[in-house]
Interface confidence: low
């Protein structure tokens, strides 16, 4: 006598709410004599899903005719799936006994999980900008997916990141799940044009993962480098002071010229030169008439970038001894 095998080919069945689910079960032998029943779960608390002989199961239909003499297909179809239907379904063979049927063999079970796609990942960056060499955190969130198994990866400019932590909630059984992941990214001076991407792969996406992105330009502040130079003009009694503000981001920058501590001009950066890496350069000029000067002049350029503390760069404009002599003559 061939030993009976209960074949449930699908380990996992993914079904969307409202769909029908077909739970397959075939047997390899007609013996021993007795019915095949369907249960959800195992142990004493298991729930009867279908019993051909008795009970009322309005949402369950059989795939084949169970009254046929040599029927070996005990597959069932459950209509209008709801979240409450999730669980593991077992087809179980019972042996005719007295006074009750005795469980003989169970199939390996088919887990029915609700199939729901994750929402498009939303990536959010830090609340405040940070400067290069500092670490910033980006958070990626996606929700509404089922089953619970999901893969999340982070990329920076296409290169996979490894410093991140991911949570899937809840831990217990649920209609749907959400994922939250936080990646830590060390900023580099050239990251103005960089992008971080969160990629979510799920069984419902058929190998086409969802992506969410964020620009590092929203998270980075590259402080300017400052250079001040002076050039005498042809006229001889004028000096052109050039103040170069280089490689800064974002654009908002204010420059104030001070002569011996007194404000003589305030400018807001407008005509900027953009560098290849996305940072900006700006040049400001100040023409100083030295013929009017009788003493050395301290010229200070004050740069305020993106609401940060002002940075000063000073230059002493030395008046020639001849001009100083003229000055002392004039006071006699």
């Amino acid at each position: 006598e061939e030993e009976l095998q209960m074949i449930q080919p699908e380990k996992l069945l993914l079904v969307a709410v409202g769909e029908s689910a077909t739970l397959n079960c075939t047997v390899t032998s007609l013996l021993p004599v007795g019915p095949v029943l369907w249960f959800r779960g195992v142990g004493p608390g298991r729930e009867l899903i279908y019993n051909q002989k008795e009970g009322h199961f309005p949402r369950v239909t059989t795939v084949s005719d169970l009254t046929k003499r040599n029927n070996m297909d005990f597959s069932i179809r459950i209509s209008s799936i709801t979240p409450a239907d999730a669980g593991t379904y077992y087809c179980v063979k019972f042996r005719k006994g007295s006074p009750e049927n005795v469980e003989f063999k169970s199939g390996p079970g088919t887990e029915m999980a609700l199939r729901a796609k994750p929402s498009a990942p939303v990536v959010s960056g830090p609340a405040a900008r940070a400067t290069p060499e500092h670490t910033v955190s980006f958070t990626c969130k996606s929700h509404g997916f089922s089953p619970r198994d999901i893969t999340l990866k982070w990329f920076k400019n296409g290169n996979e990141l490894s410093d991140f932590q991911t949570n899937v909630d809840p831990a217990g059984q649920s209609v749907s799940y959400s994922i939250r992941s936080t990646a830590r990214v060390v900023l580099a001076p050239w990251d103005v044009r960089s992008q971080v991407t969160c990629e979510v792969a799920h069984v419902t996406l058929q190998g086409d993962p969802l992506r969410g992105t964020a620009n590092l330009s929203e998270a980075i502040r590259v402080p300017p480098t400052l250079e001040v130079t002076q050039q005498p003009m042809r006229a001889g009694n004028q000096v052109n002071i050039t103040y170069q503000v280089r490689n800064f981001y974002p654009q908002n920058l204010q420059l104030t010229w001070l002569e011996n501590g007194n404000v003589c001009r305030t400018e807001t950066a407008s005509t900027l030169t953009e560098n290849k890496d996305g940072t900006y350069n700006w040049t400001s000029w100040l023409l100083v008439n030295t013929s009017d000067q009788r003493d050395d002049v301290v010229l200070t350029c004050q740069v305020k970038h993106d609401g940060q503390l002002a940075v000063n760069k000073s230059l002493v404009l030395e008046v020639s001894a001849h001009q100083k002599d003229q000055s002392s003559d004039a006071t006699h």
Epitope: G41, P44, A113, P147, T166, A171, G172, Q173, S174
Partner: antibody, heavy 127, light 107 residues
Framework: QVQLVQSGAEVKKPGASVKVSCKAS????????MYWVRQAPGQGLEWMGW????????GYAQKFQGRVTMTRDTSTSTVYMELSSLRSEDTAVYYC????????????????????WGQGTMVTVSS | DIQMTQSPSSLSASVGDRVTITCRAS??????LAWYQQKPGKAPKLLIY???SLQSGVPSRFSGSGSGTDFTLTISSLQPEDFATYYC?????????FGQGTKLEIK
């Protein structure tokens, strides 16, 4: 046999942190969710959160979010619960508990319940 | 969060009595409910899981029933060692929540 052994009683000052350990033995540590539950003197049971010992993923009750950190060390089959910014109302017995159902993540089938509990760790917060 | 409400909060009974404790969930939790027994100074002990499944090693005088929002723990014939505090707990969705407890005392 399956058991969870917790670290000893602690006395802490308000504002300090406490880290309680729970060492598992007698079963496959990474195959079952672990939970933390606390009980203030004369009060009921309060669920704090869970940890998946396989992945290290965690979930915390909103009340403890930002103050609690659950971690695990698979090499020693130990889970840890650290509670920071302690206040007097955190005085309680802290229990770790194992899930009855085998499997974590998608493999966790069936209803959850806590079948094995640690002996409890008394944490007293007093100035 | 799902609220779990137990009643009564305390009750007195005698050895041999049949005792029933009820637990109500603020929303449907299917059969994701467990019952625990706790004695003073001890950790809780699992009695029933999945609303009606008896945990291994627990005497058969304990039984659970119910589904959805209303659940019952029944002790068919009280024994001296059954005087303790009983808690229900849902594990349908996080945060898992407990009932406030029912203290069973000797009459």
């Amino acid at each position: 046999q399956v058991q969870l052994v917790q670290s000893g009683a602690e006395v802490k000052k308000p504002g300090a942190s406490v880290k309680v350990s729970c060492k598992a033995s007698g079963y496959t540590f990474t195959s079952y969710y672990m939970y933390w539950v606390r009980q203030a003197p004369g009060q009921g049971l309060e669920w704090m959160g869970w940890i998946n010992p396989n992945s290290g993923n965690t979930g915390y009750a909103q009340k403890f979010q930002g103050r609690v950190t659950m971690t695990r060390d698979t090499s020693t089959s130990t889970v840890y619960m650290e509670l920071s910014s302690l206040r007097s109302e955190d005085t309680a017995v802290y229990y770790c508990a194992k899930d009855r159902r085998r499997g974590v993540g998608l493999a966790a089938a069936g209803t959850s319940a806590f079948d094995i509990w640690g002996q409890g760790t008394m944490v007293t917060v007093s100035s | 969060d799902i609220q779990m409400t137990q009643s009564p909060s305390s009750l007195s009974a005698s050895v041999g009595d049949r005792v029933t404790i009820t637990c109500r969930a603020s929303q449907s939790i299917s059969n994701w409910l467990a019952w625990y027994q706790q004695k003073p100074g001890k950790a809780p002990k699992l009695l029933i899981y999945a609303a009606s499944s008896l945990q291994s090693g627990v005497p058969s005088r304990f039984s659970g029933s119910g589904s959805g929002t209303d659940f019952t723990l029944t002790i068919s014939s009280l024994q001296p060692e059954d005087f303790a505090t009983y808690y229900c707990q849902q594990s349908y969705s996080t945060p898992y929540t407990f009932g406030q407890g029912t203290k069973l005392e000797i009459k």
